[in-house]
């Protein structure tokens, strides 16, 4: 392994998964590396093999149990190490004492559906996936709507500062195709970040009623 610029980032999905990304400029693509997890108050140790996702980036998932099981709490600390093989030995390339609830990234919201659509508005609902009951209602959402002729990056962000798993989109254009995405973030955690965006939900507003002849 080459001593290039390195970065090791991990997030807990709040239930039973720690996802990690390791990047290192100048590292050889065939370098064999793994993430080792050593909790302070659990009887398990876990290892996952880092697999390449780009030229100088590797990723892996520490799967701690069934997807909806609560495997870690706010008092847990898990020491995470990146170990890379150098000849016959393993070398520590990165290390952190990982506090799961300071480093949260939830799964993308799922089950997006159109509840009701009209000519100028659309009511959409969704569900959160594999989110800890510890959060109670301490979640926020961001949503965006893709209009014809625009990109996702141009779409204005709508912020929902509470656990609200629905939205009523207004001032839409009749008989027009749109797409909608939403993401979620817990309020807790210094290094917590937004979930990935949900799969886009496509919908079409209803056409305007034809005016009467005069």
């Amino acid at each position: 392994a080459v001593n290039g610029t390195s970065q090791f980032t991990c997030f807990y999905n709040s239930r039973a998964n720690i996802s990690c990304v390791w990047s290192q400029d100048g590292a050889l693509q065939d370098t064999s590396c793994q993430v080792h997890a050593w909790p302070d108050r659990r009887r398990w140790n876990q290892t996952c093999e880092l697999l390449p996702v780009s030229q100088a980036s590797w990723a892996c998932n520490l799967i701690l149990g069934a997807p909806d099981s609560q495997k870690l709490t706010t008092v847990d600390i898990v020491t995470l190490r990146v170990l890379c093989r150098e000849g016959v030995r393993w070398r520590v390339m990165a290390i952190q004492d990982f506090k799961p609830f300071e480093n949260l990234r939830l799964m993308a919201p799922i089950s997006l559906q159109v509840v009701h659509v009209e000519t100028h508005r659309c009511n959409i609902s969704w569900e959160i996936s594999q989110a800890s009951h510890y959060f109670e209602r301490h979640l926020e959402f961001e949503a965006r709507t893709l209009s014809p002729g625009h990109t996702w990056e141009e779409a204005p962000l709508l912020t929902l500062k509470q656990k609200q798993e629905w939205i009523c989109l207004e001032t839409l254009t009749p008989d027009t195709q749109y797409e909608f995405q939403v993401r979620v973030k817990p309020l807790q955690g210094e290094f917590t970040t937004w979930s990935p965006w949900s799969q886009p939900l496509a919908f079409r507003t209803k056409p305007a009623a034809l005016g009467k002849d005069t």
Partner: nanobody
Framework: QVQLVESGGGLVQPGGSLRLSCAAS????????MTWVRQAPGKGLEWVSS????????HYADSVKGRFTISRDNAKNTLYLQVNSLKPEDTAVYYC???????????????????RGQGTQVTVSS
Amino acid sequence: QVQLVESGGGLVQPGGSLRLSCAASGFTFDNYAMTWVRQAPGKGLEWVSSITGAGRGTHYADSVKGRFTISRDNAKNTLYLQVNSLKPEDTAVYYCARYSSSTYYPTTPVRGTDYRGQGTQVTVSS
């Protein structure tokens, strides 16, 4: 704002010991990895030792291994460096520094710090 204040340095004879302290404020101390570096007169910064946020992982420069011990008391927001069997070549200003996240990289241990204290002078002389 982030503040790091070192203390505990002084003049000591070869073979002597000191305990350096670094009082941290302005951030959630146990969320961050910490490190000690030193600068000898006329020399560049030299990494000494690093420790993870909960103190479960430590690394040392070969020049101090077996003589220096890094530790932290997260309840007191304080980082320590116990320095034993001091040699004249340990004479330097000792600085504590915060890494910019909970992670540090033992192969490039000086990289990734974002705040450093003003330092405490350690002089080893008979």
